[in-house]
Every structure is written in structure tokens, then in C-alpha cells.
């Protein structure tokens, strides 16, 4: 029920989709939390960043993530005025030079230090209710979304046979 049902149909096209500009069309600094209001936090440990899903203490400050929005042209036979076949892709950066990456082999979400241009593994197709409730689909693996598993972020396959409104792939964005 969250705009995911068409995903499998466009698997190949999604792999082939191209970012139409090297610059983001907009950027948005927000804290990221789960549908159940647990915070996504980032901690530097042994020179690498770990990602946690946890309940914050009352006055504990939420970590912020820079979401950069890119337009991606969907290769299709849709004609018209240029408004069709476009998707929004996002990259998520909690700190300078580090971006969330999809590790499809390990079904994990990791923070990698890298330079631009970013690899495809750092791009996620944005699905949303409103701008404050979203899902992130892997550009490199259509039908696979960032989700919560055992208090960690993981990659979760969403099949059309499942409940498509699965709460563990829904995230809230907030300014606070």
C-alpha cells in the first residue's frame, strides 16, 4: 500500500535508469527514525561508523542526515511534456564524506567513505506518503528496501505477495 507494487515490473528499467544531473535538485537535513519512533544513530567506532536503531533518552539529541534529492530519468516509451518517467533518488549522508550504501551481498546497510561521483549503491529510490514518511529502495536491487531487522538497518526484500505497508521499511523524517 505504499507505492511499491509496481517495483518488480520495472526491475530492469530501474537498473538502467540514469541520474539526470550531477547536482542534487534539493537537499534536506533531517533526523531519521523508524515508523515506531526509534532513532537511527551513527557512532564512530574503531575508525569506522556503526549504524544503530535505538530509543533515545528524553533529552538526547537526534543525529541528522543530509538527504540529497536527485532526479532520475526512467527509460520508457512514455511520451509527453517531460513530466513522465522521472523518479526521485536520494543519497543519505550523516557526516561529511560518508554515505549510506547498500551491500546487496550481505543484505546490509553500511556507511562508506567515498568521493563523488557516488556509486550506484549509494542511491535509493524515494517512495513516500508525505515528505515525512518514506521508504528507500535500492537503485542496484529493485524490490529491496532499507529496513529494520534486529535493531539494525538491513536490506529487506519486499515481494508483492507480502503486506506492502510493512512498518519495518517505513521511516520518518523530521527537522527536530
Amino acid at each position: 500500500a505504499f507505492g511499491i507494487s509496481g517495483v518488480q515490473k520495472y526491475t530492469r528499467a530501474l537498473h538502467d535508469s540514469s541520474i539526470t544531473g550531477i547536482s542534487p535538485i534539493t537537499e534536506y537535513l533531517a533526523s531519521l527514525s523508524t515508523y515506531n519512533d526509534q532513532s537511527i544513530t551513527f557512532a564512530l567506532e574503531d575508525e569506522s561508523y556503526e549504524i544503530y536503531v535505538e530509543d533515545l533518552k528524553k533529552d538526547e539529541k537526534k543525529d541528522k542526515v543530509l538527504l540529497s534529492y536527485y532526479e532520475s530519468q526512467h527509460p520508457s516509451n512514455e511520451s509527453g511534456d517531460g513530466v513522465d518517467g522521472k523518479m526521485l533518488m536520494v543519497t543519505l549522508s550523516p557526516t561529511k564524506d560518508f554515505w549510506l550504501h547498500a551491500n546487496n551481498k550481505e543484505h546490509s546497510v553500511e556507511l562508506h567513505k567515498c568521493e563523488k561521483p557516488l556509486p550506484d549503491q549509494a542511491f535509493f529510490v524515494l517512495h513516500n506518503m508525505h515528505s515525512n514518511c518514506v521508504s528507500f529502495e535500492c537503485k542496484t536491487d529493485p524490490g529491496v528496501f532499507i529496513g529494520v531487522k534486529d535493531n539494525h538497518l538491513a536490506l529487506i526484500k519486499v515481494d508483492s505477495s507480502e503486506n506492502l505497508c510493512t512498518e519495518n521499511i517505513l521511516f520518518k523524517l523530521s527537522e527536530t
Epitope: 507505492g3 511499491i4 509496481g6 534539493t26 522521472k86 517512495h127 506518503m129 508525505h130 515528505s131 527537522e175
Partner: antibody, heavy 121, light 106 residues
Framework: EVQLVETGGGLVQPGRSLKLSCVAS????????MYWIRQAPGMGLEWVSS????????YYLDSVKGRFTISRNNAENTVYLQMNSLRSEDTATYYC??????????????WGQGTLVTVSS | DIQMTQSPSVLSASVGDRVTLSCKAS??????LDWYQQKVGEAPKLLIY???NLQTGIPSRFSGSGSGTDYTLTISSLQPEDVATYFC????????FGQGTKVEIK
């Protein structure tokens, strides 16, 4: 070419019902959020209702909640607005619009020409 | 709910003038703002999305700017075909239009 064609408008008495339809063509309908927006004569635009691409999530303007129902049939490329218990203040041109991006509720990328609904006794 | 307030309600300017329309949100809308143009007897048309991105086919004399709660639509050189009502629209939280600014030629 993208096309949205609204039908179903007309003159209706207060308290009665009307069902608007919007037939879409020229784009992959099932990938887009769809919307109804209205404009009372000589007035501004007012968002009325939204439905996500597979129809599982719907949203309404407070003043129409419980009276209006948005739905869609992706096999027939059609979005509907069922309007019950109509009031004189519902008199407006009703526009159907499509989202700007796949899977996203951001922006109205394209609008139909509208259908006029007049609620009067 | 987020309220959107546009000013002025009516703007009269000469052909070739630089014209600025304002839109103010009651809360921070994080650049989640569009501008729509509606000519008399026509359906509205998307001009600018995400504050400053020009929709395909829209002349480059139109531009948008702003952040937080304050946003602006600028027409660098007003043309006769720009006579219309312009609406701002936020989608950061729900969906809300401003009341519109009518642009006329002096």
C-alpha cells in the same frame, strides 16, 4: 501525450451524491499518485484528496472527510471521487492531477481541464 | 496545518519589468514548494518545483528561490503571455496552496 479527462460533473441538489471520474492516458498510471483539486468560482485552488499509486493510502481535506471517497482502478487507468452529502460550498471546478514523480507525493506534474460541480436547490 | 500566504494579491507591471511574487509559510517547509500558473479559463500548470527547479518547457525568465518559511517567484522580464494568477503550494506536511497572486499588465 499525457491526458487527464474528468467527467461526472453537473448540477446537483444539496445532500445528494455525485461521482467524478478521471481517465488517464499517455503515462504509466499505476506508478503515480493521483489527486483531486478544486476551485470555487472566482476563487483560489484547494487540494481535496490524494491517493497513492496502488490505492492503499488516501488523504482528504478536513471539510470533505467522511463525505468524499477517492479510489482508483489501475487496470482501467481511472481515478474516482465519490462525493456524498454535497453542500453548496462544494460548488467548484474539480481538477484531476497526476504526481510529478514515480511513487512520490511531491508536486502536481499535469492537470486535467476540470469538471464543474454545482450544488444548488 | 501549514498556512501559505501570498503577497501581493494583485500585481500590475509593465512589459519588460522584473516582477517578484512572495509566498510565506506558517512553518518551515524545507524547500518543498511549487509554483503554478493559471491563465483565465485554463487548468493550472506546474512552473517550478522544489523551490527553484524549472519545469520542462517553461521559459527561463521564470525562477524561484527561498528556504525555511520565505519563498519567491521572479519573472525577470514580464511578457504579455505571463498575465495569469500564480499559486504557491507546499507539500512538506500535507498539501496546501497559497491564495494566489494575480499578475496584470499596466
Amino acid at each position: 501525450e499525457v491526458q487527464l479527462v474528468e467527467t461526472g460533473g453537473g448540477l446537483v441538489q444539496p445532500g445528494r451524491s455525485l461521482k467524478l471520474s478521471c481517465v488517464a492516458s499517455g503515462f504509466t498510471f499505476s506508478n503515480y499518485w493521483m489527486y483531486w483539486i478544486r476551485q470555487a468560482p472566482g476563487m483560489g485552488l484547494e487540494w481535496v484528496s490524494s491517493i497513492n499509486n496502488d490505492g492503499g493510502n488516501t488523504y482528504y481535506l478536513d471539510s470533505v472527510k467522511g463525505r468524499f471517497t477517492i479510489s482508483r482502478n489501475n487496470a482501467e487507468n481511472t481515478v474516482y471521487l465519490q462525493m456524498n452529502s454535497l453542500r453548496s460550498e462544494d460548488t467548484a471546478t474539480y481538477y484531476c492531477a497526476k504526481g510529478h514523480y514515480y511513487y512520490s507525493s511531491y508536486s502536481f506534474g499535469y492537470w486535467g481541464q476540470g469538471t464543474l460541480v454545482t450544488v444548488s436547490s | 496545518d501549514i498556512q501559505m500566504t501570498q503577497s501581493p494579491s494583485v500585481l500590475s507591471a509593465s512589459v519588460g519589468d522584473r516582477v517578484t511574487l512572495s509566498c510565506k509559510a506558517s512553518h518551515n517547509i524545507n524547500k518543498h514548494l511549487d509554483w503554478y500558473q493559471q491563465k483565465v479559463g485554463e487548468a493550472p500548470k506546474l512552473l517550478i518545483y522544489f523551490t527553484n527547479n524549472l519545469q520542462t518547457g517553461i521559459p527561463s525568465r521564470f525562477s524561484g528561490s527561498g528556504s525555511g518559511t520565505d519563498y519567491t517567484l521572479t519573472i525577470s522580464s514580464l511578457q504579455p503571455e505571463d498575465v495569469a494568477t500564480y499559486f504557491c503550494f507546499q507539500y512538506n506536511s500535507g498539501w496546501t496552496f497559497g491564495q494566489g497572486t494575480k499578475v496584470e499588465i499596466k
